[in-house]
Amino acid sequence: EVEKTACPSGKKAREIDESLIFYKKWELEACVDAALLATQMDRVNAIPFTYEQLDVLKHKLDELYPQGYPESVIQHLGYLFLKMSPEDIRKWNVTSLETLKALLEVNKGHEMSPQVATLIDRFVKGRGQLDKDTLDTLTAFYPGYLCSLSPEELSSVPPSSIWAVRPQDLDTCDPRQLDVLYPKARLAFQNMNGSEYFVKIQSFLGGAPTEDLKALSQQNVSMDLATFMKLRTDAVLPLTVAEVQKLLGPHVEGLKAEERHRPVRDWILRQRQDDLDTLGLGLQGGIPNGYLVLDLSMQEALS
């Protein structure tokens, strides 16, 4: 906390300009009027104040706006944003996408900080849903943003926003998140033709159910092994050897390299060895000929 001292003669700031970088912290506190600072916030970012000096400027704004800064000030915070705590940000009402972009720009190239996470949370809650423009902006700055949301939060993403999602935005999503996003993507891309549809839906397929995978197997999609390995195990298990062969097309040969890994390993255990042999890949571990497979889970469901 900077001591309250009188401003030295002739040092009272008439505007926010470069001369202020030569002021000591106590001089900034004594000589810069908070209301002047608020009206000329757009200048602060262009002036190379030290982080210690920025602390003083923040203190002045905090005194002027104890209930939280108005958006006209927030939009021009620039580097001063790095001095804000999540508690400060929770007092804000940020409604403009331009304000959000301006503040994300300051943090560009860094990990998502608690301040940024709080800012985004405030913004999205204020809007009521993650619309396409917001999602576009957030994923441009933080490709992993979507996967940082809980399934509950993802449920507020309208299908129209899915168009903004790039494959790399889903890299860190887990199956629970893809379970929520996949039906939205299916709805968003439903009017596209086969090959175009597959290109768009591919990165969401970790949330696809068996029936959709069966349908895709009839469309000559040639799914790559990386995509296949991300499918839900419970969705892959009921697929027949013929369906997997059609689904993967020329990539089916890749199953051999993945035979010890899920979901391939578990799928092999469910197939008849005879059927696996038709692939000519030397896959082992299927059900031997002459064995009868009883699906106990099905039996329990019936009783």
Partner: nanobody
Framework: EVQLVESGGGSAQAGETLRLSCTAS????????MGWYRQAPGDECELVST???????NYADSVKGRFTISQDNAKNTVYLQMTSLKPEDTAIYSC?????????WGQGTLVTVSS
């Protein structure tokens, strides 16, 4: 990695002259605005002088007319010529790129002026 190495500090009598040097590496020196900061014992950090990439200079009121900042782009070095030294100029002097916003931090070079 940005590196700034200050030198030229030492002891001087009031009224004497010292020249500080700061040699930079790891960034585009001729595109950068540079500054000299100082911190006296028990006092807070203070910006002494700046020089911008176009060569324009600025000074704190307390050193105007006594200190001169300059730079040699070929040597990636910024200088602070300090004349008519006063005891109140005693401090650790550090040079910084203004974009770093750091101020007084790191080693610096100690200047001690006795009356």
């Amino acid at each position: 990695e940005v590196q700034l190495v200050e030198s030229g500090g030492g002891s001087a009598q009031a009224g004497e002259t010292l020249r500080l040097s700061c040699t930079a590496s790891g960034f585009t020196f001729d595109d950068s605005d540079m500054g000299w900061y100082r911190q006296a014992p028990g006092d807070e950090c203070e910006l002494v002088s700046t020089i911008s990439s176009d060569g324009s200079t600025n000074y704190a009121d307390s050193v105007k007319g006594r200190f001169t900042i300059s730079q040699d782009n070929a040597k990636n070095t910024v200088y602070l010529q300090m004349t008519s030294l006063k005891p109140e100029d005693t401090a650790i002097y550090s040079c910084r790129t203004m974009a770093s916003r750091i101020g007084c931090w790191g080693q610096g070079t100690l200047v001690t002026v006795s009356s």
